[in-house]
Interface confidence: medium
């Protein structure tokens, strides 16, 4: 990887024990306002493969609230609005971070978690299993 | 929201300050041992709506490397193999959380980031701008 | 209705600099790829660049690393920085937007909708 | 680069009259060929797109056909107004180009 030399102006609190504790700022900075705000607002309802959106919450993660898609057919709209069966909707999954509190209910205290999201659906062409 | 009674063992670190700074473990949990360690590794390849994946790498986040999808038509493919402009491939875009590092080049202090990155493609029906 | 305004033409020595400008309105600007489209007097029409959705950046070889195409999707604008310029980027410059109806971050788009022109004379 | 060559460069003719351009392109550009109209000291204006769609607004008189590298701007009824300079593009290939334009005139 890259080396980058460390700043001299850094908190000092190293800790000799890898993996290690870190000081996080929760003042998130957003870099998204360059990106479309509508983004994919709309696509679950327009795409061939639509999906609805379910609320996970957890108050002991962060962010508390997750959207996870749900793919409502299990193959894909076709041209005349029916739901096709030689194509399949499935989901756009993708591992995330988050902050879990640990000790559990502690309010500055967290371990980074990787979870596993469904974003959105995708229709895909199905694989076919041929028999020997 | 719901209101959980703080642990007696949490880390004393509070900041009166708010937005505040956190320990963060860093040794991350990996929710996912039960998935699909495929996940949707294929449907790049096989959605009506293709992507390619394209690595953005940035030694002063973490994670370091993120895959950003990029749809490879601006139609979608048809059952006969050809781009169909009457549809649209879309991005699927979600906004997650990185950390960044904060001042640079800190091995120990960070800040959260939210940016927004595009996990695969859908396809939809093109919106139909009407003249009035 | 969709509206592109430029700026920032004129005249500049061989080698200077100039940086065009493109107000654009009536549209959600961030969701839509961008593009600069030149005409030499009495010519025909020169894709220039195009900037996407996302921010990815496309140019004609004789412009690469010479020019470059950038966005502000908080103030509708679009930007073409023309460094090292050359007596046969003497043209006018267009900006042009594609139509309303693909969303996508993918650049191969037509022009729908294209400002007045704004010309740019390289000459000593 | 995709060439695209625009016959004829120039055409004189009448109101009423029947007029067909050209656009052959040196390699298949499939169906990502457009149509625009430029009047002097004007930006273009799109016409058609994707070979034979017709813009919103456009008269019915104009239409596109073709396919792979042969395309045709047909305007089946000239009007003074269509009196301009008619260009080709391309968007299947990087960098995507212009035809060098036909011009229509008056007879």
């Known amino acids: 990887g890259i080396t980058i030399p460390r700043n001299p102006g850094c908190p000092n609190s190293e800790d000799k024990n890898f993996p290690r504790t870190v000081m996080v700022n929760l003042n998130i900075h957003n870099r998204n306002t360059n990106t479309n705000p509508k983004r994919s607002s709309d696509y679950y309802n327009r795409s061939t493969s639509p999906w609805n959106l379910h609320r996970n919450e957890d108050p002991e993660r962060y962010p508390s609230v997750i959207w996870e898609a749900k793919c409502r057919h299990l193959g894909c709209i076709n041209a005349d609005g029916n739901v096709d069966y030689h194509m399949n909707s499935v989901p756009i999954q993708q591992e995330i971070l988050v902050l879990r509190r640990e000790p559990p209910h502690c309010p500055n205290s967290f371990r980074l978690e990787k979870i596993l999201v469904s974003v959105g659906c995708t229709c895909v062409t199905p694989i076919v299993h041929h028999v020997a | 929201g719901i209101t959980i009674p703080r642990n007696p063992g949490c880390p004393n670190s509070e900041d009166k300050n708010f937005p505040r700074t956190v320990m963060v473990n860093l040794n991350i949990h990996n929710r996912n041992t039960n998935t699909n360690p495929k996940r949707s590794s294929d449907y790049y390849n096989r959605s009506t709506s293709p992507w390619n994946l394209h690595r953005n790498e940035d030694p002063e986040r973490y994670p370091s490397v993120i895959w950003e999808a990029k749809c490879r038509h601006l139609g979608c493919i048809n059952a006969d193999g050809n781009v169909d402009y009457h549809m649209n491939s879309v991005p699927i875009q979600q906004e997650i959380l990185v950390l960044r590092r904060e001042p640079p080049h800190c091995p120990n202090s960070f800040r959260l980031e939210k940016i927004l990155v595009s996990v695969g493609c859908t396809c939809v029906t093109p919106i139909v701008h009407h003249v009035a | 209705e969709v509206q592109l305004v430029e700026s920032g033409g004129g005249l500049v020595q061989p080698g200077g600099s100039l940086r065009l400008s493109c107000a654009a309105s009536g549209f959600t600007f961030p969701s839509y790829g961008m593009a600069w489209v030149r005409q030499a007097p009495g010519k025909g029409l020169e894709w220039v660049a195009t900037i996407d959705a996302a921010g990815d950046t496309y140019y004609r070889d004789s412009v690469k690393g010479r020019f470059t195409i950038s966005r502000d999707n908080a103030k509708n604008s679009l930007y073409l920085q023309m460094n090292s310029l050359r007596a046969e980027d003497t043209a006018v410059y267009y900006c042009?937007?594609?139509?309303?109806?693909?969303?996508?971050?993918?650049?191969?788009?037509?022009?729908?909708?294209w400002g007045q022109g704004t010309l740019v004379t390289v000459s000593s | 680069d995709i060439q695209l060559t625009q016959s004829p460069s120039s055409l004189s003719a009448s109101v009423g009259d029947r007029v067909t351009i050209t656009c052959r392109a040196d390699?298949?550009?499939?169906?990502?060929m457009h149509w625009y109209q430029q009047k002097p000291g004007k930006a273009p204006k799109l016409l058609i797109y994707?070979?034979?769609n017709s813009e919103i607004g456009v008269p019915d008189r104009f239409s596109g056909s073709g396919s792979g590298t042969d395309f045709r701007l047909t305007i089946s009824s000239l009007q003074p107004e269509d009196f301009a300079t008619y260009y080709c593009?391309?968007?299947?290939?990087?960098?995507?180009?212009f035809g060098q334009g036909t011009k229509v005139e008056i007879k």
């Open positions: 390699e298949s550009v499939k169906t990502l």
């Open positions: 593009q391309q968007t299947y290939s990087a960098p995507h180009t």
């Open positions: 042009a937007a594609p139509p309303q109806t693909y969303e996508g971050s993918i650049y191969r788009l037509w022009f729908a909708h």
């Open positions: 994707l070979v034979s």
